[in-house]
Every structure is written in C-alpha cells, then in structure tokens.
C-alpha cells in the first residue's frame, strides 16, 4: 500500500535543494514543469545551502520535520476532522505552517524568519544557521528571481502530485 | 509562543546521528542520560551515515520528513480527536508509522525496512539507500549493539523531552 | 505602469464599521507584501498591518490589533482593510504600499483614502 | 517594541546648504532602516533603503549612513525641491515604526 502524503513533491524539491545536488533538483523541477528562470532562482537558494556546508542541509531539514511533525500541522488535520469527522478532508495539501516558513523565508524579513523558526526549535545552532541562510538568500536573489521562485512554488502547491 | 512538537528529543537524535557530527549526537544523548553502551550503539549507526556520505543523510531526513507528515501520522492525530474531540489527545508522543520505521531499521531485515519505507517515498534512489544504510547497520551492530539502542529509544520515547 | 488605488473611505461614527479597499494593477499581485499605513491630519505616517501575499503571515501595530483585520483576494488583485470599532484617533488618510521582495521597504504606494470618525 | 526618535523637528536651512538628519533605534537593527520623503500634499516616496542604498531616480544629493541604533539622512546641496517631511522606518520586523519626521524648510 502506497501511502497518501502531504504534497511529497514539495518535500523532494525541498530536500533537492537542502542537498545541494543539481541533477537531483533539475529532476524534481521537470516533473513541475519548471521554466528557465524558476529553475535559476531555486538554484541560487540551494548555492546558499552549499556554501553554508552540511550543518545547514541537516538543521535546516530538523526544522523541516518538526514543523512538519508539529502540533501546529497535527491541528489543521484535526480542525477539518472536527469539522466533518471524514479523513479525506485532510487532502494532501501542505501544512500551512509550513507555507508561512517557505513564505517568510522568501518574501520576510532574516528576523521575521527566524522569529518564525525560533517558535519551533529554539536551539540557538538552528536559529543562527536560519539567518545565515536567510541573509545568504536575500543577498543572492533579486526581485525577479524571487518572483520566479514564488512562482514556481504556485506550481507545486497546485502540481497533481502535490 | 513557542509550538509544541512531537517528540522533539526524538528529531534531534535522528538529525544528530544523520550528521555525521559526533559533539551533536553526544549532547542530544546527554539529555537523554546515555550509557556509554548505548552511545557506542548510536556512534555505529552514526558512522554508517557517515560512510555513505551526504546523499544518504538527505534521502533518510526526506524518509523521516515525508513520514513525519504522512496521512498516516496525521490519522492518528485524527483518530483519536474522533474519539473525544480534545485536541490534546495528540500528546507530544511520536507517531507509530515514525516508531514503526525506526523498529524494521534495527530489529527487521533489509527487506522489511525497506518495504515500510517504500510504503512512504518509492523513489529508486530512497529505496537503494535505504538498503545501503540497513545492510551497513547490520553488519556494524552486535546482538549487544541493538539491545542497547533499543533501550536508548525507550529512554527518549519516554523522556520528559519527547 | 504599477499602480495602487484606495477606495472606501469617508465619515462614520464612532463605534462604527468601514471596509477600505486597495486595486492593484501592473505587478504579479499575488506574489507581493502589502501593507497599509496612515497619516492623521497633520501627523505623521504610523504603519497599520502587513499581509503576505498568500496570506500566510499577517501583523497588526498594537492600536488596532483586534478592530482593524486585512485579506487579500488575488484573483481580483485587491486587498482589503476591515474596520471595526472605530474611534476618533483613527481618523486619517489610508495609504496601501507594496514591500519589495528584496529589500522589505515601500516602493509604491497608492494615493490614500480619507476616513472621518466623528459624531 | 523597538522606538524610532527622529530629530531635529523642524530644520530650518538655506539652498545650497548640507542639511544632516538622524534618526535613533532603541535597540539594534542593523542596517533595515528606510528614508521616505513627503512633499506637501502629496504621497511619500522611498528615497533610501538599507541605511544608505539610493532608491532608483533619487538624485544623488541624498545619501543615507548608519548601522545598529545610529542612522543619518544627508543633504549635500540643499535645493528649493527638497522642502519636504522626512520619515525614517525600521523595518527589520514588525511593527515597522516610522519616526515622527522631520520637517525641512527654506530660510
């Protein structure tokens, strides 16, 4: 039995990208249809965890999983239970705590991101890797790539195989 | 306000071992009151990440992450809010798919573990990394080994950090 | 050319309600911050709210936390300021302004909308 | 919250002069600190971003200095154009505090 996921997609491009590995990104970009610009800027964001070393891959996917994992996801699965006790309603749509993280991590402000990190893993390791990470973001991307990066996240929200 | 996590604890060991990074594991172990035993344990598991490189740290986080947030994990967040409607029922207490995952990894054969993570994440890539972990895993570990990191999960699951 | 235009103001008692609205035009709506910021008369500029553009995070300055609530409907590339409770230091003009992606400052505002509370 | 205190209000100067307005944040902010410019009547407009980037089509009279709490608008050649309130504003987080402004006249 395959299990239902939430938007697995969105986790492949993720971890792609946290793993710094271009074939395995462009692999995970074809399958959204990605165009020329979209993939570029998801490049620069993973040059960001590269140069930024392994650290950043394995703490950024910590707080990854335990947004993921946390009560603050858990909760919106509930609440639509609650609602209509029918387990389909969970959907496979992504947390959207988990959108509000990739949504300040492009269009937030470093302190406003890692204020958000913060409300999830405190450690002050993962915190300061959030901000370098987040400045390293800002400094490469320009006003079109991250509208390109924001555009492409549309496309995994709304991808069949999300 | 800070978000309760499911099993935090938990996460940190998993991230720590996936790192490679031996002062990492030995202060998430410390919180945990290891013995010496169960951290040699560990440290072999931490040593076969390591041996297959970064590749195999980012596939096995994607395989927790997708897990973490699987339809599977949420029903049981569902389930038990069916039954009394008391959104503290979801506890802080880790998700049986996610304990189920980590049991087949130390006490089921490569096939086993690897047909519970296909259940999760079918890429070809996951699966053979998945094997290459299992298989290093079992050539590592002593009986001994596994007693010891099995009653190392018993001290996590039940800590007052998870 | 990229633009934003505020309507919905005028006189209401206080106590009363008033729904602002801001179209915007020449940009990818969707993909941008917006914030809503007003000047009493002969004031300065005091920031009112902030949303994101999915609507994922939203914030609020401590006057009006729990009065004033903002959404955004990007399929009609407009955004909307509800106000509630109104009271007579909320009298002023409503400007709407994009945030850069980049670097997180205004770069395009509208050209306001005056709210009058008074009995 | 962190508390913006522009001075000095009003500034009073003469066409040509090199005209210096400060602007104080409580507490540290690096460099997330925007200038706005407001002609009478009219809406405000970005004149400088992150403490000393000029804003595209600003005239090159203006400069911006400053990181952490301490933050300076400079005017090198004042001109009758630039007879205007100015504005500082954190925007590091929320709330995105303006100063009180300063308001610039001619001699």
């Known amino acids: 039995v395959k299990m239902a996921e939430t938007c697995p997609i969105f986790y492949d491009v993720f971890f792609a990208v946290a793993n710094g590995n271009e074939l395995l990104l462009d692999l995970s970009l074809t399958k959204v249809n990605a165009t020329e610009p979209e993939r570029t800027a998801m490049k620069k964001i993973q040059d960001c965890y590269v140069e930024n070393g392994l650290i950043s891959r394995v703490l950024d996917g910590l707080v990854m999983t335990t947004i993921s994992s946390s009560k603050d996801c858990m909760g919106e699965a509930v609440q639509n239970t609650v609602e209509d006790l029918k387990l389909n309603t969970l959907g496979r749509e992504i947390c959207p705590a988990v959108k509000r993280g990739v949504d300040l991590f492009l269009t937030g402000t470093p302190d406003e991101y890692v204020e958000q990190v913060a409300q999830y893993k405190a450690l002050p390791v993962v915190l300061e890797n959030a901000r370098i990470l987040k400045n390293c973001v800002d400094a490469k991307m320009t006003e079109e790539d991250k509208e390109n990066a924001l555009s492409l996240l549309d496309k995994i929200y709304t991808s069949p195989l999300c | 306000v800070k978000m309760a996590e499911t099993c935090p604890i938990f996460y940190d060991v998993f991230f720590a071992v996936a790192n490679g990074n031996e002062l990492l594991l030995d202060l998430s172990l410390t919180k945990v009151n290891a013995t010496e035993p169960e951290r040699t344990a560990m440290k072999k598991i931490q040593d076969c990440y390591v041996e297959n490189g970064l590749i195999s740290r980012v596939l096995d986080g994607l395989v927790m992450t997708t897990i973490s947030s699987s339809k599977d994990c949420m029903g049981e967040a569902v389930q038990n809010t069916v039954e009394d409607l008391k959104l503290n029922t979801l506890g802080r207490e880790i998700c049986p798919a996610v304990k189920r995952g980590v049991d087949l990894f130390l006490t089921g054969t490569p096939d086993e573990y690897v047909e519970q993570v296909a259940q999760y994440k079918a890429l070809p890539v996951v699966l053979e990394n998945a094997r290459i972990l299992k298989n290093c895993v079992d050539a590592k570990m002593t009986e001994e080994d596994k007693e010891n990191a099995l009653s190392l999960l018993d001290k996590i699951y039940t800590s007052p950090l998870c | 050319e990229v633009q934003l235009v505020e309507s919905g103001g005028g006189l209401v008692k206080p106590g009363g309600s008033l729904r602002l609205s801001c179209a915007a035009s020449?940009?990818?709506?969707?993909?941008?911050?917006i914030n809503w910021v007003r000047q009493a008369p002969g004031k300065g500029l005091e920031w009112v709210s902030l949303?994101?553009?999915?609507?994922?995070?939203?914030y609020y300055a401590d006057s009006v936390k729990g009065r004033f609530t903002v959404s955004r409907d990007n399929a009609k590339n407009s955004l909307y300021l509800q106000m509630n409770s109104l009271r007579a230091e909320d009298t002023a003009v409503y400007y709407c302004?994009?945030?850069?992606?980049?670097?997180?400052?205004?770069?395009?505002w509208g050209q306001g909308t005056t709210v009058t509370v008074s009995s | 919250d962190i508390q913006v205190t522009q001075s000095p209000s009003p500034l009073s100067a003469s066409v040509g002069d090199r005209v210096t307005i400060t602007c104080r944040a409580s507490q540290g902010i690096s460099n997330y600190l925007a200038w706005y410019q407001q002609k009478p009547g009219r809406v405000p407009q970005l004149l400088i971003y992150a403490a000393s980037t000029l804003q595209s089509g600003v005239p090159s009279r203006f400069s911006g200095s400053g990181s952490g709490t301490d933050f300076t608008l400079t005017i090198s050649s004042l001109q009758p154009e630039d007879v205007a309130t100015y504005y500082c504003q954190k925007y590091n987080s929320a709330p995105y505090t303006f100063g009180q402004g300063t308001k610039l006249e001619i001699k």
């Open positions: 020449g940009f990818t709506f969707r993909n941008y911050n």
């Open positions: 302004a994009r945030r850069t992606l980049s670097y997180y400052v205004m770069d395009v």
């Open positions: 949303i994101s553009g999915s609507s994922s995070y939203i």
